[in-house]
Interface confidence: medium
């Protein structure tokens, strides 16, 4: 007879889950020459233990200290660049301005980008079929805690300017419900954080709007100024002119505005 | 054939300086991760300091801010400068390259330089 | 002070089995990787093991290695007289930044 099993609203496990996390961590250490010592397989066994056996409804941040504790690692703090609903973009911009960081540049964040997991109480099987959906199901499934861990501490790390990319193409170019605006906006330290700095990314080439008038950003500018952290905000017109530019400085069109 | 030549060993007087040097030949300095360890008498290994591929440095606490690792690219040629020397730094001094990749221990050593650190 | 814990000594007879431990903690061991050199007398060490299990070439596969947790071991089986020698146990230590290798255990081929 099949055992009755739990079925989510959300999409199931990523195929190849266990192989695709362990390949990416060997990966990782051999790029990273400051983390190439990190024992690949006990970051595996750390990440299984936070979930395996578990109901993937009663996660919690606890459950993921043993992966933190493996997975530590010291980015420069005033190198750190958060993102909001525009994750390709703010890739692109670390890719070209390699001494800047995204969550998923860190080992952690690299190992869990865009994977989906979630396992089954009281058994040690992954469940490919279905996974808990944050809104219909619940929030404390095993992927919304890990990112919620991984964002606070990495948000905790950061000093002096921090810089957060948003899209100025989404109706709530800074949402309180986003990862950065929930989690990564309260845990930036006030005496270790002197600026938020947002670049707002427009959408449209004809889009000459000023953005950061925008009635969320002057929400994120009054949560942030209430904090004791200055806040400062910066249109970013021209998106591909701007990783251009980055890529090339010198250029002459890059005096100009972007 | 890969092997490394250390050399710059001897007698010195507490509180003076003294620089080593790790000839590398087979493969280049620059292009891996190069260690240096020391051995006191009858003791045994101490990790000294490590200079990365891409010239990040780090020291062992009990040398940190004396000793000084470096490399010469067109020398092939890896050094460690000694300051401040004390009757514990007496030892055998070797480099070893440890390879830059998954695997990464310590796979080619040289045959040690004798470090003497008396008055 | 070593932070890696290994016996002082261990001895076997030719063709015996010896293993020896080696002890850390979580920001050693616990989390990275762990090689094992072999020092001849009045030799340079040599690499014996690397990432945990893994012979380098030219190492006989009667040298293995494991590691559970925040300890690691290596085992010799079938003893020869030119095993003697000293062992080192290695592993990067996160809190302190560098390098830790063990004590040294001095093997003894009776």
């Known amino acids: 007879v099949p055992r009755w099993r739990q079925q989510w609203s959300g999409p199931g496990t990523t195929k190849r889950f266990p192989e695709t996390v362990l390949a990416r961590c060997v990966k990782y250490t051999e790029i990273h020459p400051e983390m190439r010592h990190v024992d690949c397989q006990s970051v595996w066994d750390a990440f299984k233990g936070a979930f395996i056996s578990k109901h993937p409804c009663n996660i919690t941040e606890e459950d993921y200290q043993p992966l933190m504790k493996l997975g530590t690692q010291t980015v420069p703090c005033n190198k750190i660049l958060l993102w909001s609903r525009i994750k390709d973009l703010a890739h692109q911009f670390t890719q070209v301005q390699r001494d800047m960081f995204t969550l998923e540049d860190t080992l952690l964040g690299y190992l869990a980008d865009d994977l989906t997991w979630c396992g089954e109480f009281n058994t040690s099987k992954i469940n490919y079929q279905s996974c808990p959906d944050w809104r219909k199901d619940c929030s404390n499934n095993p992927v919304s805690v890990f990112w919620k861990t991984v964002s606070r501490r990495f948000a905790e790390a950061a000093c002096d300017v921090v810089h957060v990319m948003l899209n100025g193409s989404r109706s709530k170019i800074f949402d309180k419900n986003s990862t950065f605006g929930s989690v990564e906006v309260h845990n930036l330290q006030p005496e270790k954080v002197q600026t938020l700095e947002a670049w707002v990314i427009h959408g449209g080439r004809e889009d000459s709007r000023d953005l950061c008038q925008d009635p969320t950003i002057k929400e994120l500018e009054s949560i942030i100024s209430k904090r004791n952290i200055q806040f400062s905000c910066k249109n970013i017109y021209r998106p591909d002119k701007f990783l251009q530019c980055v890529k090339n400085p010198e250029d002459s069109s890059c005096t100009s505005e972007i | 054939q890969v092997q490394l030549v250390e050399s710059g060993g001897g007698l010195v007087q507490p509180g003076g300086s003294l620089r080593l040097s790790c000839a590398a030949s087979?493969?280049?300095?620059?292009?891996?991760?190069m260690n240096w360890v020391r051995q006191a008498p009858g003791k045994g290994l101490e990790w000294v300091s490590v200079?990365?591929?891409?010239?990040?440095?780090y020291y062992a606490d009990s040398v940190k801010g004396r000793f000084t690792v470096s490399r010469d690219n067109s020398k092939n040629t890896l050094y460690l400068q000694m300051n401040s020397l004390t009757a514990e730094d007496t030892a055998v001094y070797y480099c070893?390259?440890?390879?830059?990749?998954?695997?990464?221990?310590?796979?080619?050593w040289g045959q040690g330089t004798t470090v003497t650190v008396s008055s | 002070q070593s932070v890696l814990t290994q016996p002082h000594s261990a001895s076997g007879t030719p063709g015996q089995r010896v293993t020896i431990s080696c002890s850390g903690s979580s920001s050693n061991i616990g989390g990275n990787t762990v090689n094992w050199y072999q020092q001849l007398p009045g030799t340079a060490p040599r690499l014996l093991i690397y990432t945990n299990n893994k012979r380098p070439s030219g190492v006989p596969d009667r040298f293995s290695g494991s590691k559970s947790g925040t300890s690691a071991s290596l085992a010799i089986s079938g003893l020869q007289s030119e095993d003697e020698a000293d062992y080192y146990c290695a592993a990067w230590d996160n809190s302190l930044k560098g390098y830790v290798f063990g004590t040294g255990t001095k093997l003894t081929v009776l």
């Open positions: 200079i990365y591929s891409g010239g990040d440095t």
């Open positions: 070893a390259r440890e390879y830059s990749g998954y695997y990464y221990g310590m796979d080619v």
């Open positions: 087979g493969f280049t300095v620059s292009g891996n991760y």
